[in-house]
C-alpha cells in the first residue's frame, strides 16, 4: 500500500524519494510520474533524471534536494485538487529487475 | 532554437528608473526559471538574483536587495529587470541567463545579449 | 557567501599549447562548479558543468577536473579563436558566486 502525504491547495507539495549513489555525482536514472508504477518506467513522466542530470521535466515539478546525493525527492508547486492521486519513484538501477518503485499517495486537502 | 533576446542600450540620469526586458522563445517559458547577472564595464559577472517563472517568486542576492525587482509578462514570455534611484555604479552590462529550476541545478545554459545601462548625470 | 579564486589572472599563450586554469572554493562544494567562455563584446558560453560534464556543441579539447574546493579546466591544444575571459561558478549554494576569471591571450 502506498504512503500519504497531504498538502493544501495552493501550497507545494512534496514527495520523498532517495537512494544512495555509488558516488557523489554517480548517478542512477530516476523517473517521476503520475500514477502507480507499472511494470517498466514511469507512467504519465513528470520529472526525469539520468546518469549526468535532470533531463526532463514539466512546469510546476521540480527537485528541491541534492540529486546528485540521491535526494530525488519531488515537489509540486501550487498544487490543486486535480494534483491529488498516486505518483510513482523509480529508481532505475542497473540490471534486470533491479528498480526500486515507491508508489506515493498525494492527499490535497 | 533557443533565445533570450534583450531590450537595447539604456542611457539615465541618477534617481531615474530603469526597466529592463529579456524575451525568451525556442522552450516553454515556465519550466526554467531566470536569472540576471551584472556585468560593471572591465569587471566579472555578479550574480543579482533569480525568478520562478511560474510562481513569479524572486530570489535576490544581498547586494541586490531594494532598488531592484524582477517580474514577469508570461503571456509574452518575458522577464524584466527593474532598478529604481539609479546610481552611477548601476553602470554595467546586465545579462538574463536561464536557469533549471531544480534547487541544485546551477548552471546557465542560454544568456541573452546584454543590455548596456549608462547612468551619468 | 563562497569566494571563488581564479588563477592566474592572465596567461599568455602559444597556438596548439596545453593549459591549465585553476579555480578554488573557500569551501568544499563537490562538483557542483561550471565553467564559462567570455569572449569580447559577447555574452558568457557554458563550457562545462559539475566540474567534468562536457557540454553539447562544445570542442573537444575542454576539459574539467576537480571536485571539493580544487578545480582545472584544461584546453588540450588552444586555437586563436580560445581568446577570452573564462570563468569558474560555484553552483551549490546561492548566491552562485563567479570567480574573478582568468583572461587568455595568445602570444
Known amino acids: 500500500s502506498e504512503v500519504e502525504y497531504r498538502a493544501e491547495v495552493g501550497q507545494n507539495a512534496y514527495l520523498p524519494c532517495f537512494y544512495t549513489p555509488a558516488a557523489p555525482g554517480n548517478l542512477v536514472p530516476v523517473c517521476w510520474g503520475k500514477g502507480a508504477c507499472p511494470v517498466f518506467e514511469c507512467g504519465n513522466v513528470v520529472l526525469r533524471t539520468d546518469e549526468r542530470d535532470v533531463n526532463y521535466w514539466t512546469s510546476r515539478y521540480w527537485l528541491n534536494g541534492d540529486f546528485r546525493k540521491g535526494d530525488v525527492s519531488l515537489t509540486i508547486e501550487n498544487v490543486t485538487l486535480a494534483d491529488s492521486g498516486i505518483y510513482c519513484c523509480r529508481i532505475q538501477f542497473p540490471g534486470l529487475m533491479n528498480d526500486k518503485k515507491f508508489n506515493l499517495k498525494l492527499v490535497i486537502k | 532554437q533557443i533565445q533570450l533576446v534583450q531590450s537595447g542600450p539604456e542611457l539615465k540620469k541618477p534617481g531615474e528608473t530603469v526597466k529592463i526586458s529579456c524575451k525568451a522563445s525556442g522552450y516553454t517559458f515556465t519550466t526554467y526559471g531566470m536569472s540576471w547577472v551584472k556585468q560593471a564595464p572591465g569587471k566579472g559577472l555578479k550574480l543579482m538574483g533569480w525568478i520562478n517563472t511560474y510562481s513569479g517568486a524572486p530570489t535576490y542576492a544581498d547586494d541586490f536587495k531594494g532598488r531592484f525587482a524582477f517580474s514577469l509578462e508570461t503571456s509574452a514570455s518575458a522577464a524584466y529587470l527593474q532598478i529604481n534611484n539609479l546610481k552611477n555604479e548601476d553602470t554595467a552590462t546586465y545579462f538574463c541567463?536561464?536557469?533549471?529550476?531544480?534547487?541544485?541545478?546551477?548552471?546557465?545554459?542560454?544568456w541573452g545579449q546584454g543590455t548596456t545601462l549608462t547612468v551619468s548625470s | 557567501d563562497i569566494v571563488m579564486t581564479q588563477s592566474p589572472a592572465t596567461l599568455s599563450v602559444t597556438p596548439g599549447d596545453r593549459v591549465s586554469l585553476s579555480c578554488r572554493a573557500s569551501?568544499?562544494?563537490?562538483?557542483?562548479l561550471h565553467w564559462y567562455q567570455q569572449k569580447s563584446h559577447e555574452s558568457p558560453r557554458l563550457l562545462i558543468k559539475y566540474a567534468s560534464q562536457s557540454i553539447s556543441g562544445i570542442p573537444s579539447r575542454f576539459s574539467g577536473s576537480g571536485s571539493g574546493s580544487d578545480f582545472t579546466l584544461s584546453i588540450n591544444s588552444v586555437e586563436p579563436e580560445d581568446v577570452g575571459v573564462y570563468y569558474c561558478q560555484n553552483g551549490h549554494s546561492f548566491p552562485y558566486t563567479f570567480g574573478g576569471g582568468t583572461k587568455l591571450e595568445i602570444k
Open positions: 569551501q568544499s562544494i563537490s562538483d557542483y
Open positions: 541567463a536561464r536557469k533549471p529550476p531544480h534547487y541544485y541545478v546551477n548552471s546557465f545554459d542560454y
